[in-house]
Amino acid sequence: FKVATPYSLYVCPEGQNVTLTCRLLGPVDKGHDVTFYKTWYRSSRGEVQTCSERRPIRNLTFQDLHLHHGGHQAANTSHDLAQRHGLESASDHHGNFSITMRNLTLLDSGLYCCLVVEIRHHHSEHRVHGAMELQVQTGKDAPSNCVVYPSSSQDSENITAA
């Protein structure tokens, strides 16, 4: 399977909420013998490999923000820790995997990475990640709502294959 980032850039005004999204593509096993681990973290756009560095999102690590669920399930972070920091990650039945950030500040600007680990029990595991940029703006140049820019299909940094 692959992970795609439908949007490579999100430009938002300060104080707005935003939902960053990754999507699983290709043959995703939805059986009982599959478990998915999914998480989010901040990173920097390295010269060689995007998403190598793992930095916290609003002081929450990728461990704090992770979800795990069976192939046939949906999931979301319900723990107070994430919500106290204005964060919620969620995953649906259709392969969409998102993190919602509330009340954005300029400090939230940066590169965000999603990581998905698929465990096929008694068989194998695969891990894939995707990257997208969030720009939070203030002042007269800021948009009134979030503006999203689609990823080009050729943008290999935003789709990694397992």
Epitope: H68, I119, H126, A162
Partner: antibody
């Protein structure tokens, strides 16, 4: 602080089954974010992953050893085991148990290792 | 199986030298590679994960880089306590290790 401790016989006869146990302390083997695995190292040689068990009891095994390996887990005792059947001298090695973080990827905690010699 | 080829198998360098070890994967493993240090009689110790991330408490003289199939591990200024064998391991799929590099002091 998480600690892993291997135990079992240091000498096994050829064609018999090697049995080792790893006792985990300072953390729960039922934690959902981890694999619990076995790695071996023949004297003076490199590391070979044998297999791993998921908290739910599901397993991954090295394809080259799969027909001979079983890794049971006992969550009530906070331990997991290794059973390797039909051993030969080539199975003589230091056997390590280790924890592997699913999200990070590598084995982050290891036992100190136990030497197993296969000899008649 | 993903094969990991590590080189050199051994090296000897002086204290303060920059030491470089390479690891090559038989197929693309993105950046899902880790490096361990193993001192004689001890279990391996995690140094680096995701090719370049330093594990907690690991001295900054250790570093890693690379992506895809080719990876490099560097000790910037070799210290006497760095005498050990170093292993790479991929975790793009079921784990496999490199053959190891024994580092000695001249």
């Amino acid at each position: 602080q998480l600690q892993l401790q291997e135990s079992g016989p240091g000498l096994v006869k050829p064609s018999e089954t090697l049995s080792l146990t790893c006792i985990v302390s300072g953390g729960s083997i039922s934690s959902s974010g981890y694999y619990w695995g076995w790695i071996r190292q023949p004297p003076g040689k490199g590391l070979e992953w044998i297999g791993s068990i998921f908290y739910s009891g599901n397993t991954h095994y090295n394809p080259s050893l799969k027909s001979r390996v079983t890794i049971p887990v006992d969550t009530s005792k906070n331990q997991f085991s290794l059973k390797l059947s039909s051993v030969t001298a080539a199975d003589s090695a230091v056997y390590y148990c280790a924890r592997r973080d699913i999200l990070t990827g590598p084995f982050d905690y290891w036992g100190q290792g136990t030497l197993v010699t296969v000899s008649s | 199986d993903i094969q990991m080829t590590q080189s050199p198998s051994s090296l000897s360098a002086s204290v303060g030298d920059r030491v470089t070890i390479t690891c090559q994967a038989s197929q693309d493993i993105t950046n899902y590679l880790t490096w361990y240090q193993q001192k004689p009689g001890n279990a391996p110790k995690l140094l680096i994960y995701d090719a370049s991330n330093l594990h907690t408490g690991v001295p900054s003289r250790f570093s890693g880089s690379g992506s895809g199939t080719d990876f490099t591990f560097t000790i910037n200024s070799l210290q006497p306590e760095d005498v050990a064998t170093y292993f790479c391991q991929q975790y793009d799929n079921l784990p496999t290790f490199g053959g190891g590099t024994k580092v000695e002091i001249k």
